[in-house]
C-alpha cells in the first residue's frame, strides 16, 4: 500500500495510473467503500463522500491514462485509505494528514517560550524534528518546546514530520519581538547633543503600545522617569517628559530621543521599556551615557569622565603629536603645570579611541581656550 503524507490546509494529489494511455472508466472510493468520484464516459461524477466540494480530478489527464484524486484544504480527518478502481485493478493509497501549529501567537517576546503542537491522525506514530533559523535542532513527539527565545530565533522554523519512512515539511514563521541591541553606550563631550536610538529588530504592519525611559544618573541616589510615550500604528506621541533634562522624541519609528546637552549630571544608564498591545511582558533596551570634560584651573589640567565605564578603559592626557603624559584606568587624570599647546584627553579601549576632547593651554599669562 502506498503511503502519502499531507499537510493540513494544503492540497494533495493521489495518483492512479492505467496501463492504457486513454480515457477509461475509473472510481475513487474511501475505506468504507463510499464513492468519492469517478467518470461516466467523458463526465466526472461525484459520490456522497464527506469530501464533497473539496475533491476533484483533472479531466485533461484522463487520456494520458492518469486519473488523479485531488483533495484541497486537507483536514486531519481526511486521513484514510483511498482506493482507485481502474482496469479491474485496485490501487490503494493511505493518506495521513498532519498539522503543526504554534499554540501561542507566532509573535513572541524575547525570553518567552515557543511551543509547537503536532496534530496527527489516530494510529500514527510520527516523530518531529525542527530546525531554528540559527541552526539549532529540537526533537519531540506531539509537542516541542523552546524556552528563552532569543533574537536569532526570529525567522522560518523548518519542521520535518517522519512517518512510515516518508516525510512532510512544515515551515513556521516566528517573530521574536525585541530591540536590535540589548544594550548600547553613547560617548559624548560635555555640551554636545546626545542622540539615543532604539531600533526594533522586527517589522509588523501595526505596532501599538506604550513605553518609558527610566534613568539612573551616576550622581543621583535613585532612578527617575525621563519620558513616557505612546505608540499607535507606528506613530509616537509623548505623554509626559521631565523638565530637566528636556528630552525630545521623534514622531516615527525607530524610537529616537534627543538630549540637548551632555552634562556630567546626566551621565549614567537608562532602561527603555516598551509594552506592546496584546502582549504580556515588555521589551527592554539598556542605554548608557558617558560624558567627558577637560578643564584647566590655575596650573592644573584635568580630564574627567562620568558614567558607566568598564575598568579596562584607559583615560589619557597628551600634548598633540606627543606621547601621553598621563594614562590611567581611572575616571579622572590630570597634569600639573601643563606646557602650552593643544592637549588631548582620550578615552580608549585597547587602543581604540572612544571619546576625545581637546583643550588649548596658553602660555601662563593667558587664560585657556576650549576649541
Amino acid at each position: 500500500k502506498k503511503v502519502v503524507l499531507g499537510k493540513k490546509g494544503d492540497t494533495v494529489e493521489l495518483t492512479c495510473t492505467a496501463s492504457q494511455k486513454k480515457s477509461i472508466q475509473f472510481h475513487w472510493k474511501n475505506s468504507n467503500q463510499i464513492k468519492i468520484l469517478g467518470n461516466q464516459g467523458s463526465f466526472l461524477t461525484k459520490g456522497p463522500s464527506k469530501l464533497n466540494d473539496r475533491a476533484d480530478s483533472r479531466r485533461s489527464l484522463w487520456d494520458q491514462g492518469n486519473f488523479p484524486l485531488i483533495i484541497k484544504n486537507l483536514k486531519i480527518e481526511d486521513s484514510d485509505t483511498y482506493i482507485c478502481e481502474v482496469e479491474d485493478q485496485k490501487e490503494e493509497v493511505q493518506l495521513l494528514v498532519f498539522g503543526l501549529t504554534a499554540n501561542s501567537d507566532t509573535h513572541l517576546l524575547q525570553g518567552q517560550s515557543l511551543t509547537l503542537t503536532l496534530e496527527s491522525p489516530p494510529g500514527s506514530s510520527p516523530s518531529v524534528q525542527c530546525r531554528s533559523p540559527r541552526g539549532k535542532n529540537i526533537q519531540g513527539g506531539k509537542t516541542l518546546s523552546v524556552s528563552q527565545l532569543e533574537l536569532q530565533d526570529s525567522g522560518t522554523w523548518t519542521c520535518t514530520v517522519l512517518q512510515n519512512q516518508k516525510k512532510v515539511e512544515f515551515k513556521i514563521d516566528i517573530v521574536v519581538l525585541a530591540f536590535q541591541k540589548a544594550s548600547s553606550i553613547v560617548y559624548k563631550k560635555e555640551g554636545e547633543q546626545v542622540e539615543f536610538s532604539f531600533p526594533l529588530a522586527f517589522t509588523v504592519e501595526k505596532l501599538t503600545g506604550s513605553g518609558e525611559l527610566w534613568w539612573q544618573a551616576e550622581r543621583a541616589s535613585s532612578s527617575k522617569s525621563w519620558i513616557t510615550f505612546d505608540l499607535k500604528n507606528k506613530e509616537v506621541s509623548v505623554k509626559r517628559v521631565t523638565q530637566d533634562p528636556k528630552l525630545q522624541m521623534g514622531k516615527k519609528l525607530p524610537l529616537h530621543l534627543t538630549l540637548p546637552q551632555a552634562l556630567p549630571q546626566y551621565a549614567g544608564s537608562g532602561n527603555l521599556t516598551l509594552a506592546l498591545e496584546a502582549k504580556t511582558g515588555k521589551l527592554h533596551q539598556e542605554v548608557n551615557l558617558v560624558v567627558m570634560r577637560a578643564t584647566q584651573l590655575q596650573k592644573n589640567l584635568t580630564c574627567e569622565v562620568w558614567g558607566p565605564t568598564s575598568p579596562k578603559l584607559m583615560l589619557s592626557l597628551k600634548l598633540e603629536n606627543k606621547e601621553a603624559k598621563v594614562s590611567k584606568r581611572e575616571k579622572a587624570v590630570w597634569v600639573l603645570n601643563p606646557e602650552a599647546g593643544m592637549w588631548q584627553c582620550l578615552l580608549s579601549d585597547s587602543g581604540q579611541v572612544l571619546l576625545e576632547s581637546n583643550i588649548k593651554v596658553l602660555p601662563t599669562w593667558s587664560t585657556p581656550v576650549q576649541p
Partner: antibody, heavy 123, light 107 residues
C-alpha cells in the same frame, strides 16, 4: 505579493542549451501544477510542458526528449532545462500557474502568469 | 491533439461596440474552455473559465457561452482598455491547446 518571475533567457546557438527558472512567491507553490507556455514573436500561445504536484511531467511532442521540466518546492522554483535548441524554439517563455476549479468536473485554467523571458535561438 | 480555431483573426471596433469572438474545437470538449486577454508586451490574463464562469475581478461586460465544439466570447460594450488579443484554450485533454488569437483594435 502573489507572483511568478522568470529568468535565464538569452541568445543561444542552434544545438545549444539554456536553463530557465521561475521563482514563485506569495502562494503555496507545492499545491499547484505549474507550466511553461511560449509565444514565438508575433505568434500565438503554445503550451510547452507541465509538472504536477507530485512531480509527474507532461510535454508537447515537439520538445519531448529535448526539454526537461522540474521543480524545487523548498526553493519555490520551477525550471525548464532546454537542450538541442532549434530556431523554432525562439519565443518568450512564460511560467504559468494552473488553478483547479474544484467544480467536481476537473476544470482548470492558467490563473497566474509571469512576465516572460525571451529565448532566441540563432547562429 | 485537439485543434482550436478562432474567428475573426482580427477586428476593428469602436468604444461602446458589442464585440463577439468565436472559438471552435476540432472535437467535443464539453465546457472545458478558457478565454484569455493579452496586451502587447504583457502576459496573458484569464477572463473566463469553464466556458462561461467569469474570473474574479474581471468586468461583467465580458461573458462566455457555448458547449461541445462552438464557443463565444462577448464584450457587451467595448472599453478603451479592451483593445487586445483574445485567446481561447481547451483543457479537455493534454496537450492543452490555444486558439490562434483574435486581435481587437480601434476602428
Amino acid at each position: 505579493e502573489v507572483q511568478l518571475l522568470e529568468s535565464g533567457g538569452g541568445l543561444v546557438q542552434p544545438g545549444g542549451s539554456l536553463r530557465l527558472s521561475c521563482a514563485a512567491s506569495g502562494f503555496t507553490f507545492s499545491n499547484h501544477y505549474t507550466s511553461w507556455v511560449r509565444q514565438a514573436p508575433g505568434k500565438g500561445l503554445e503550451w510547452v510542458s507541465s509538472i504536477g504536484v507530485n512531480g509527474d511531467t507532461y510535454y508537447l511532442d515537439s520538445v519531448k526528449g529535448r526539454f526537461t521540466i522540474s521543480r524545487d518546492n523548498s526553493k519555490n522554483t520551477l525550471y525548464l532545462q532546454m537542450n538541442s535548441l532549434r530556431a523554432e524554439d525562439t519565443a518568450v517563455y512564460y511560467c504559468a500557474r494552473e488553478g483547479l476549479v474544484f467544480s467536481g468536473r476537473g476544470h482548470w485554467y492558467f490563473d497566474l502568469w509571469g512576465r516572460g523571458t525571451l529565448v532566441t535561438v540563432s547562429s | 491533439d485537439i485543434q482550436m480555431t478562432q474567428s475573426p483573426s482580427s477586428l476593428s471596433a469602436s468604444v461602446g461596440d458589442r464585440v463577439t469572438i468565436t472559438c471552435r474545437a476540432s472535437r467535443n470538449i464539453h465546457d472545458y474552455l478558457n478565454w484569455y486577454q493579452q496586451k502587447p508586451g504583457k502576459a496573458p490574463k484569464l477572463l473566463i473559465y469553464a466556458a462561461s464562469t467569469l474570473q474574479t475581478g474581471v468586468p461583467s461586460r465580458f461573458s462566455g457561452s457555448g458547449s461541445g465544439t462552438d464557443f463565444t466570447l462577448t464584450i457587451s460594450s467595448l472599453q478603451p482598455e479592451d483593445f487586445a488579443t483574445y485567446y481561447c484554450q481547451q483543457t479537455y485533454s493534454t496537450p492543452p491547446t490555444f486558439g490562434p488569437g483574435t486581435k481587437v483594435d480601434i476602428k
